[in-house]
């Protein structure tokens, strides 16, 4: 797991998984208009 100051800060903010990898933003959509429907 990542224990650098940056990783600790990000983990507290909920941006990192326990393994230290970035967590995906759980499908908060970006660029919606580039996708058809």
């Amino acid at each position: 797991a990542c224990n650098t100051a940056t990783c600790v800060t990000h983990r507290l903010a909920g941006l990192l998984s326990r393994s230290g990898g970035m967590v995906k933003s759980n499908f908060v959509p970006t660029n919606v208009g580039s996708k058809a429907f």
């Epitope: 499908f27 908060v28 959509p29 919606v32 208009g33 580039s34 996708k35 058809a36 429907f37």
Partner: antibody, heavy 115, light 108 residues
């Protein structure tokens, strides 16, 4: 298999409100936005807006602000659209459509506004 | 808002004929924001082409799309009876998203 099942036809009086539903199945409901589209009889398509079920964020066509309200219920994987202060101009088929390039649309809900 | 003007409004074609429908935007848009839909009578629309030139899943290869800026087109390489429908372009570049007024394709 992805499916969007919309609620049945509605016949309502002018001035009333109506809330129609779009039940999603076959995919993770919070993984795509849900669009709503209006089609008057014999006419073209008009985008109303979309809702992001993950965080209930919405974007509206300015024309439909104050007319349409989009909501969703994650527990039942259902998107809703409420239309208020109905007039004959609101008589149309309303479609929900899953955002993405895979082309999933509901079958449409027919709304008739008549006294 | 971005206005999409389709041409022609209606057309009739013979089986086997090549068809081209155009979509002109009132402002320049990136091709990733331009999509095409097909709507058969009594049915919901379905996406044919997304991002100007990408064929949607299950769509026959006789359909193709191209264009950039303010000028886009949908082509049917060889018209078939099952292609009778109304075709719409749609832009997702700016809100409100808008559709073209539609091109009704009939068979001779």
């Amino acid at each position: 298999e992805v499916q969007l099942q919309q609620s049945g036809p509605e016949l309502v009086k002018p001035g009333a409100s109506v809330k129609m539903s779009c039940k999603a199945s076959g995919y993770t409901f919070t993984s795509s936005v849900m669009h709503w589209v209006k089609q008057k009889p014999g006419q073209g398509l008009e985008w109303i807006g979309y809702i992001n079920p993950y965080n209930d964020g919405t974007k509206y066509n300015e024309k439909f602000k104050g007319k349409a309200t989009l909501t969703s219920d994650k527990s039942s994987s259902t998107a809703y659209m409420e239309l208020s202060s109905l007039t004959s101009e609101d008589s149309a088929v309303y479609y929900c459509a899953k955002g993405g390039n895979d082309g999933y649309w509901g079958q449409g809900t027919t709304l008739t506004v008549s006294s | 808002e971005i206005v999409l003007t389709q041409s022609p409004t209606t057309m009739a074609a013979s089986p086997g004929e090549k068809i081209t429908i155009t979509c002109s935007a009132s402002s320049s848009i990136s091709s990733i924001y331009l999509h095409w839909y097909q709507q058969k009578p009594g049915f919901s629309p379905k996406v044919l082409i997304y991002r100007a030139s990408n064929l949607a899943s299950g769509v026959p290869a006789r359909f193709s799309g191209s264009g950039s800026g303010t000028s886009y087109s949908l082509t049917i390489g060889t018209m078939e009876a099952e292609d009778v429908a109304t075709y719409y372009c749609q832009q997702g570049s700016t809100i409100p998203f808008t559709f073209g007024s539609g091109t009704k394709l009939e068979i001779k």
